[in-house]
Interface confidence: medium
């Protein structure tokens, strides 16, 4: 058998920011990012990963939260939440998603 | 939006080189792997080789019938991909497309640049 | 080195029509087939991966089937804006290798 040919990034993924060039793109995985800065509403921005992997081995904080997957437009309907650190009355995952 | 622009296509003789670029937008060019294509008038499309991306190595993969006289660089500062044909034959005319994807998927491709080999 | 057999070279068809483009390989290339479309003067566009994903953002009446040698791109429904070139790729194998190309004309 004839040695398959290598490939770099191959998952289509969801792509949804300020840096997409499209409607999708194509990466080693696709990602979920929710940020939240300060004084600001939180922002989940769906897109694909090349570099960085352990990103997506972090836990959970009340500022980021960043979820990764690896198959076909894995990241579509995926919606995270960041840490509770703030009173009930302030839930900031659930704003902007 | 993705863009792919060919030039530096044109007329050489037999025997002489020519270096083609390929200018890119609308994406991370350094992290992808580019890839040329060629298309011979009347005849179907042929992998002429690859540049996967430095992160990965930036090595290089050709085709048979161009390997030893064809060299795949790139410059990520400049987002452009080269090709630089030496040693130029007849059958080398073709138009030439620059494209990129994994190095295996041609996710977008370029209108083309004309070579015409011929003395 | 695998060699594709596209058919037809050309064919004709008219709105509404269900289209059939066969690919076949030499060799058993698993489902490492992508299927292309290309206008003339325009970049080609990516159509189908992996022999039957569609590739987001294409319409659905484009469907690809197959595995193996023996492969299909169909097009159901046919519209006048789907006359172009088509041709299969496959990545199974260095060299990669392209079919022959279908050319659609829509009457």
């Known amino acids: 058998d004839p040695v398959k040919p290598s490939r770099g990034p191959l998952v289509t993924c969801t792509c949804e920011s300020p840096h997409c060039k499209g409607p999708t793109c194509r990466g080693a995985w696709c990602t979920v990012v929710l940020v939240r800065e300060e004084g600001r509403h939180p922002q989940e921005h769906r897109g694909c990963g090349n570099l960085h992997r352990e990103l997506c081995r972090g836990r959970p904080t009340e500022f980021v939260n960043h979820y990764c997957c690896d198959s076909h437009l894995c990241n579509h309907n995926v919606s995270l939440v960041l840490e509770a650190t703030q009173p009930p009355s302030e839930q900031p995952g659930t704003d902007g998603q | 939006e993705v863009q792919l622009v060919e030039s530096g296509g044109g007329l050489v003789k037999p025997g002489g080189s020519l270096r083609l670029s390929c200018a890119a937008s609308?994406?991370?060019?350094?992290?992808?792997?580019m890839s040329w294509v060629r298309q011979a008038p009347g005849k179907g499309l042929e992998w002429v080789g690859r540049i996967k991306s430095k992160t990965d190595g930036g090595t290089t993969d050709y085709a048979a019938p161009v390997k030893g006289r064809f060299t795949i660089s790139r410059d990520d500062s400049k987002n452009t991909l080269y090709l630089q044909m030496n040693s130029l034959k007849t059958e080398d005319t073709a138009v030439y497309y620059c494209?990129?994807?994994?190095?295996?998927?041609?996710?977008?491709w370029g209108q083309g640049t004309l070579v015409t080999v011929s003395s | 080195e695998t060699t594709l057999t596209q058919s037809p070279a050309f064919m004709s068809a008219t709105p509404g029509d269900k289209v059939n483009i066969s690919c076949k390989a030499s060799?058993?290339?698993?489902?490492?087939m992508n299927w292309y479309q290309q206008k003339p003067g325009e970049a080609a566009i990516f159509i189908i991966q992996e022999a039957t994903t569609l590739v987001p953002g294409i319409p659905p009446r484009f469907s690809g089937s197959g595995y193996g040698t023996d492969f299909t791109l169909t097009i159901n429904n046919i519209e006048s804006e789907d006359a172009a070139y088509y041709f299969c790729l496959q990545h199974d194998n260095f060299p990669l290798t392209f079919g022959g190309g279908t050319k659609v004309e829509i009457k």
């Open positions: 609308g994406f991370t060019f350094s992290n992808a792997w």
């Open positions: 494209t990129t994807g994994d190095g295996t998927h041609f996710d977008y």
């Open positions: 060799q058993d290339i698993d489902d490492d």
